[in-house]
């Protein structure tokens, strides 16, 4: 049932990077406006992006406020010129979307390496602490902040004259590995939430290698 | 539920090359890293290397660099071992494993591999 | 490379007893240590990962500590079931290396 000329929103999809999160839809509107409702299970429906034409809608304040909680949001479709009008049943035709904890599902935004700096046969590598949109007493977290230990970086490094490449991990956004002097090296990181069965882990960073602006060396 | 079934193990000739298999079942390969471990008869056990499969990024341990090869074919979610210019001291059991980032939380049954003339 | 150095490489205990088993590795791993069990003619088993925590399903009289390059492994009362061979591994960078194993039977 629906109200002439409106259709029920479909294809309600989470998209969320280091909790910056925006819900995405479909159809593009013909004679048609869109508002978005977003909840937590026990609290009230908030509305956002109000009679818009958009097919998205950014939800990053609202999800912000406790990522560990799981959120449902819904699409009320309304007529361009009569947003008062309602469906057959007496209220907007609208669609849910999918339950989203940010927590659990938010991907891992691509990593950068920072610096990396050599003293000897040892090179400390450091991942950059990406700043999100989650706050906590008026201050932004970063990713580590947000994740704790939950959070690991996996380092694959290989000498710039050979394919052979090696791996290392830490629970923290350093690493401190070996090298043989005289040679120089090639870095990427990977963010991984172990605990995690889905967006278990990001993308790659861009490789920085030694020889390039951002290192340092030490004897 | 989760599974991981090692298949292509068998009897070979010094020098030749063998391929094992290890499909994947109950979740999709390239969310995680993924092992190849051996362990010769009464022997411990030995890790060969790893590949990220979303990524293609392999690690060897440098004794396996050059003649093993890991792969993985993530529309197939199966991950492979190549196995080049074999010796009788590659005879062994061949475990592939799913690697969480804290430990290796499921492993195959094990395909034996038995080189000899 | 790190090397991973277990011992006892075999050990001997009756029903009850406590049981330890080290490792002790070349360099710092940083807790990068797992303990496994393996069974005759079976895949290895994690009982204890990131040198302390207990993997999902264990039994608590297995327990792991340690941080650095010493770690210990312990059966607070060894049961006929825990007949096996353990091996720590380190993964805190590769090539990961497995201890040689220490063999458990039972007086």
């Known amino acids: 049932s629906g109200t002439t000329n409106t259709v029920a929103a479909y294809n309600l999809t989470w998209k969320s990077t280091n909790f910056k999160t925006i819900l995405e839809w479909e159809p593009k509107p013909v004679n048609q406006v869109y508002t978005v409702q977003i909840s937590t299970k026990s609290g009230d429906w908030k509305s956002k992006c109000f009679y818009t034409t958009d097919t998205e809608c950014d939800l990053t304040d609202e999800i912000v406020k406790d990522v560990k909680q799981t959120y449902l949001a819904r699409v009320f479709s309304y007529p361009a010129g009569n947003v008062e009008s309602t469906g057959s049943a007496g209220e907007p035709l609208y669609e849910n979307s999918p339950e989203f904890t940010p927590y659990l599902e938010t991907n891992l935004g691509q990593p950068t390496i920072q610096s990396f700096e050599q003293v000897g046969t040892k090179v400390n590598v450091t991942v950059e602490d990406e700043r999100t949109l989650v706050r906590r007493n008026n201050t932004f977290l970063s990713l580590r902040d947000v994740f704790g230990k939950d959070l690991i970086y996996t380092l694959y490094y290989w000498k710039s004259s050979s394919s052979g490449k090696k791996t290392a991990k830490t629970n923290t956004n350093e690493f401190l590995i070996d090298v043989d002097k005289g040679e120089n090296y090639c870095f990427s990181v990977q963010a991984v939430i172990p605990s995690r069965t889905v967006n278990r882990k990001s993308t790659d960073s861009p490789v920085e290698c030694m020889g390039q602006e951002k290192g340092e060396f030490r004897e | 539920q989760v599974q991981l079934v090692e298949s292509g193990g068998g009897v070979v000739q010094p020098g030749r090359s063998l391929r094992l298999s290890c499909k994947a079942s109950?979740?999709?390969?390239?969310?995680?890293?993924m092992h190849w471990v051996r362990q010769a008869p009464g022997k411990g056990l030995e890790w060969i290397g790893l590949?990220?499969?979303?990524?293609?990024?392999?690690i060897y341990d440098p004794k396996f660099q050059g003649r093993f090869t890991i792969s993985a074919d993530n529309s197939k979610n199966t991950l492979f071992l190549q196995m080049d210019s074999l010796r009788p001291e590659d005879t062994a059991v061949y475990y592939c494993?799913?690697?969480?980032?804290?430990?290796?939380?499921?492993w195959g049954q094990g395909t034996p591999v038995t080189v000899s003339s | 490379d790190i090397q991973m150095t277990q011992s006892p490489s075999s050990l001997s205990a009756s029903v009850g007893d406590r049981v330890t088993i080290t490792c002790k590795a070349s360099?710092?791993?940083?807790?990068?240590l797992n303990w496994y069990q393996q069974k005759p003619w079976k895949a290895p088993k994690t009982l204890i990962y990131?040198?302390?925590s207990l993997a999902d399903g264990v039994p608590s009289r297995f327990s792991g500590s340690g941080s650095g390059t010493d770690y210990t492994f312990t059966i607070s009362s060894l049961q006929p079931e825990d007949i096996a061979t353990y091996y720590c591994?380190?993964?805190?960078?590769?090539?990961?290396?497995f201890g040689q194993g220490t063999k458990l039977e039972i007086t």
């Open positions: 494993a799913r690697d969480n980032s804290y430990y290796f939380d499921y």
């Open positions: 591994l380190q993964h805190g960078e590769s090539p990961y290396t």
């Open positions: 590949i990220d499969p979303e990524n293609g990024n392999t």
């Open positions: 360099q710092d791993i940083r807790k990068y």
């Open positions: 109950g979740f999709n390969i390239k969310d995680y890293y």
């Open positions: 990131y040198a302390t």
